[in-house]
Structures are given as C-alpha cells and as structure tokens.
C-alpha cells in the first residue's frame, strides 16, 4: 500500500470515543504520553485529535481496480509532533514524537463500519485494528470481515468547533 501524495487530502479535528461512548484521553506522564479509555464527567472537556487523511493505492495484486483502487489512510495526532503508532510486536498503540515523513507505523487504513463510526487498521499489519482492551488502546487481530463490526474496534468521531490543536 503506497501513499499517493505526501500531503493529506484533508484534515479533521475531532474528539475520539469508543462505540459505548467512553472518551479516548491523552496524558503527559514522565515525559511520555499515556493513552486512556475512560468515562468523562458531564462537563469535562474531551481531548481532540487531528486526523489527517491520505489517499493510498491498493497493491496491484490485491485489487482489479486500477486507478480506482484507492483507500483512505489516516494519521492521528493529539498534540503537536506526536502521533499514534502501531507497535505490532507488543500489540500496543503508543504515542511517539516523529518528524515527517512519518513512519508506516503511524498510518492506519480507515474503515467505515457504520455511517457514524470508524475503525483503524494498521498499515504495517493488515487485519490488525486499534481496539479497546482493559481500558487502554491495543492492537486487536480481526480474523474476518464478519468480526469487523465487533464493538471494541469501533470508534466515533465527534466534531469540534476549535480549529487549532494544542
């Protein structure tokens, strides 16, 4: 899967929550960021994530689509210069400081399972998705398309009216 352009086709600032409405939050601890999945209090402010959308071409052996075989890939950045990364060895999702061009571990194939929810498939490990495990984000292997609707890999993006990210 190759990214067809070095610039995102669009960027979108949103808060990220699980399918059962827990918020994804980010906390700086001991000079590194931790990612949490938690219930927020009623008026507690949701953390925002900058989603950058890139077009990507299917590998030619995977698709008969030719120029039509495009997918969307996203990178997720909750704060400047930090991006979510897939650590495929540890089956974990981590926040790392990176410079552009970002490594492949920072890219996720965007899936819409429902009209109002998305899933993120690791570019570096097809069939492995960001999911929720023990109140943390983790990489979860999904065996077949029948399991793609499993709720622990579904996330909601809710719009925000702020146009900068901290």
């Amino acid at each position: 899967m190759s990214i067809t352009g070095i610039s995102p086709i669009t960027e979108y600032l949103a808060s990220l929550s699980t399918y059962n409405d827990q918020s994804i939050t980010f906390a700086l601890e001991d000079e590194s960021y931790e990612i949490y999945v938690e219930d927020l209090k009623k008026d507690e402010k949701k953390d925002k994530v900058l989603l950058s959308y890139y077009e990507s071409q299917h590998p030619s052996n995977e698709s008969g689509d030719g120029v039509d075989g495009k997918m969307l890939m996203v990178t997720l950045s909750p704060t400047k210069d930090f991006w979510l990364h897939a650590n495929n060895k540890e089956h974990s999702v981590e926040l790392h400081k990176s410079e552009k061009p970002l490594p492949d571990q920072a890219f996720f194939v965007l899936h819409n399972m429902h009209s109002n929810s998305v899933s993120f498939e690791s570019k570096t490990d097809p069939g492995v998705f960001i999911g929720v495990k023990d109140n943390h984000l983790a990489l979860i292997k999904v065996d077949s398309s029948e399991n793609l609707s499993t709720e622990n890999i579904l996330f909601k993006l809710s719009e925000t009216h702020h146009h900068h990210h901290h």
């Epitope: 669009t10 979108y12 698709s63 008969g64 194939v109 899936h111 399972m113 109002n116 398309s145 719009e159």
Partner: antibody
Framework: EVQLVETGGGLVQPGRSLKLSCVAS????????MYWIRQAPGMGLEWVSS????????YYLDSVKGRFTISRNNAENTVYLQMNSLRSEDTATYYC??????????????WGQGTLVTVSS | DIQMTQSPSVLSASVGDRVTLSCKAS??????LDWYQQKVGEAPKLLIY???NLQTGIPSRFSGSGSGTDYTLTISSLQPEDVATYFC????????FGQGTKVEIK
Amino acid sequence: EVQLVETGGGLVQPGRSLKLSCVASGFTFSNYWMYWIRQAPGMGLEWVSSINNDGGNTYYLDSVKGRFTISRNNAENTVYLQMNSLRSEDTATYYCAKGHYSYSSYSFGYWGQGTLVTVSS
Amino acid sequence: DIQMTQSPSVLSASVGDRVTLSCKASHNINKHLDWYQQKVGEAPKLLIYFTNNLQTGIPSRFSGSGSGTDYTLTISSLQPEDVATYFCFQYNSGWTFGQGTKVEIK
C-alpha cells in the same frame, strides 16, 4: 473499466413492488460501500439507501424506511433495491453508485446510467 | 439531519467568465463535501471530493474551497461543455444533496 448496470425499472401500479438490480464489474466489489440515489423527473438528486462492504449495515432515507430494502451479493457482484408499497412520489430514475474509496462511506466515485421507475395507475 | 442549500438556482454567464457556485450546510460538515456535475440526459459525475480535491480526469479550471458550513465551487474560465447542473453533497453525517445550480451560457 468500472461498470455499473442497473436493471428492473418499469411501470408499476401504486402499492405494488419492484426489485432493482445493479451488476458491478471492473473493481473489487466486496471492498466498497454501495448506494442507491434517485432523481424524480426534472428534479434534483436524492440519496435513498446505503450498504456497507459486507452487507451488515444498511441505511435509508426516512420516506422509504420500512418499504425499501437494500441488499448485496458479493459473490455475484450485485446490489439490489427491493421496493414495496410503491407510491407515485417514488417515480424517478434510480442510480446505483459505488464508494470512492475501499472500505469508506465517503463520496460516490462512479455511477451507473440509471433505471426509470414509474409508479402510476 | 443536515440540510444543504445551494445558490443561485440558475446561473447564466459568458464563455471565459469566472463562475462561483455556493453551498451552505445547516451544520459544520468538516469539509466532508463533494461536487457532482450532471449534464442533460447523463448520470452525475464526481468532480471534487473532500471540498477541494479534483477527481482524476476533471479539468483544472474546476476548483473547490470552504470549511465549516460554507463551500464554493469555482470554474475559472467557463467553457461550453460546462453547461450542466451542479450538486453539492455532504457525507459528514448521513448523506444529503443540495438542490442544484443550473449553469447556462449567455
């Protein structure tokens, strides 16, 4: 080359049923959301229904909910629209469309030529 | 539900003119907006997606811009073959078309 060919349109009386089919070729059908969009004579476009890649999630325009059913057969590269209890206001050209991106419900990347449904007594 | 309102309904301009079509959403749609062109007797065709990305094969005289609730399609130099109806379309929340703008040559 991507192709979408709709069939099944025609003249039908109010209250009767009709089933539209759309046969797809030139792309990996099971990777794409599929859609039905309609256009009443001389009017604008109106989204009618959507179905995700594996057929597990379907969506409908409020005015057709409970009357229309979208489905797909990925083995046969075909998407269907079963239309029951048809009304005169359902008269339109019905277009089949495919998503612009694999796996994503964004944009209609390609459209068929449409099939005309006329509901009249 | 999100409503999409296009203006004007009909636009008449001369060949070579710069033409601007407007589309307004009832809520913020986060640039999740397309423009489709439909010529008489033909199926619609995707022109621009995600607000400002030109579909493969579409002439560069077409461009899109906007954010939040306000979006614009611009034809930098109107050509006779651009006579068509143009529809905006949002997919941020559900799927909704605008009512269309018909572009004619004076």
